[in-house]
Amino acid sequence: SEVEYRAEVGQNAYLPCFYTPAAPGNLVPVCWGKGACPVFECGNVVLRTDERDVNYWTSRYWLNGDFRKGDVSLTIENVTLADSGIYCCRIQIPGIMNDEKFNLKLVIKPAKVTPAPTRQRDFTAAFPRMLTTRGHGPAETQTLGSLPDINLTQISTLANELRDSRLANDLRDSGATIRIG
């Protein structure tokens, strides 16, 4: 059965998912999708990482944590009732049928009071060619919700000398956690 998480309309939702890289540099691709985990991959993918970086995300969805040490917990910005449902965190371990799948149920409650239009997080992009116009000073600060879907295929490389992660400490949050290797 799914682990249940709650958030209020207008707030940010947090869906925990962790793994511990087996060896230095061995990051594992991860996908997040809306809907229960299917047999393969993720359905309705909202975010994806590869062996080096976040390489795809959609508006309002982000990894706030240190994904290079296996914290692939998903943050959903400014949730609405439509965000309720099952989300799949899939740790894509190499090999046939080796993937670890976690279904997390998000329940959105109506806000206690009507929230003022506050910006909970700033999201600034340093790629003028994608999100801002060249020659206009600092990159504009935007909210996640205003961003287009982005697919990064060439981003900063991860060195081979990554040391063992210490991330899989006792997680008080009882989120999805797996040790690889």
Partner: antibody
Framework: EVQLVESGGGLIQPGESLRLSCAVS????????VAWVRQAPGKGLEWVAT???????YYADSVKGRFTISRDDSKNTVDLQMNILRVEDTAIYYC????????????????WGQGTTVTVSS | QAVLTQPPSVSGAPGQRVTISCTGS?????????VHWYQQLPGTAPKLLIY???NRPSGVPDRFSGSKSGTSASLAITGLQAEDEAVYFC???????????FGGGTKVTVL
């Protein structure tokens, strides 16, 4: 507006305890990394402890076993319980939202408080 | 001992351009972790100057710019002004700790 306000500093004797508190507004501590960083008089910045989005704590070797970082989601606060204080713990202690970026794209910007002063002296 | 290496001091005349280097290793900057820069005036808390290698928060003059390449990063100040006299720190993350790592700080003197 994102703000972090530290409190609880003071003058204390070696071996005693002190509890610092960081009141957060503008974002929820749950789902975010919050760190304590200190700066001894005339010195550089030193990381002390971090609590991650799920509530797991991490510590610098210099404070491990003596300091405890915790948070209260309902109050949106992050505390640092400091036990067995030493003279070398004398510093300004800052609370900060820690931010992880990918290739220059960040979900949030780092934000620091103004700090609270801890003086350990006999 | 700071994990990231900065020069202890740099100086320049008003209007000049100065750069501050921040050298790390394959376990921090070279591992893909981005770099933030802070300015600290005497008796005040560190102020965020650059985050995510090159992003300027609102209110920070465009005289300040940051970049990152390989295992190092740099902060450039163009058109140096008297009020830029301060200590500048770089910050990143490291694969060996779930915490932040800092440079030792660079004192900028305006001649």
């Amino acid at each position: 507006e994102v703000q972090l306000v530290e409190s609880g500093g003071g003058l204390i004797q070696p071996g005693e305890s002190l509890r610092l508190s960081c009141a957060v507004s503008g974002f929820t501590v749950r789902g975010n990394y919050v760190a304590w960083v200190r700066q001894a008089p005339g010195k550089g910045l030193e990381w002390v402890a971090t609590i991650n989005g799920g509530g797991s704590p991490y510590y610098a070797d210099s404070v491990k076993g003596r300091f405890t970082i915790s948070r209260d989601d309902s109050k949106n606060t992050v505390d640092l319980q400091m036990n067995i204080l030493r003279v070398e713990d004398t510093a300004i202690y800052y609370c900060a939202r820690d931010t992880y970026c990918t290739a220059g794209i960040c979900p949030s910007s780092p934000v620091w408080g103004q700090g609270t002063t801890v003086t350990v002296s006999s | 001992q700071a994990v990231l290496t900065q020069p202890p001091s740099v100086s320049g005349a008003p209007g000049q351009r100065v750069t501050i280097s921040c050298t790390g290793s394959s376990s921090n900057i070279g591992a893909g972790y981005d770099v933030h820069w802070y300015q600290q005036l005497p008796g005040t808390a560190p102020k965020l100057l650059i985050y995510g290698n090159s992003n300027r928060p609102s209110g920070v003059p465009d005289r300040f710019s940051g970049s990152k390449s390989g295992t190092s990063a740099s902060l450039a100040i163009t058109g140096l002004q008297a009020e830029d006299e301060a200590v500048y720190f770089c910050q990143s993350h490291d694969t060996s700790v779930t915490g932040v790592v800092f440079g030792g700080g660079t004192k900028v003197t305006v001649l």
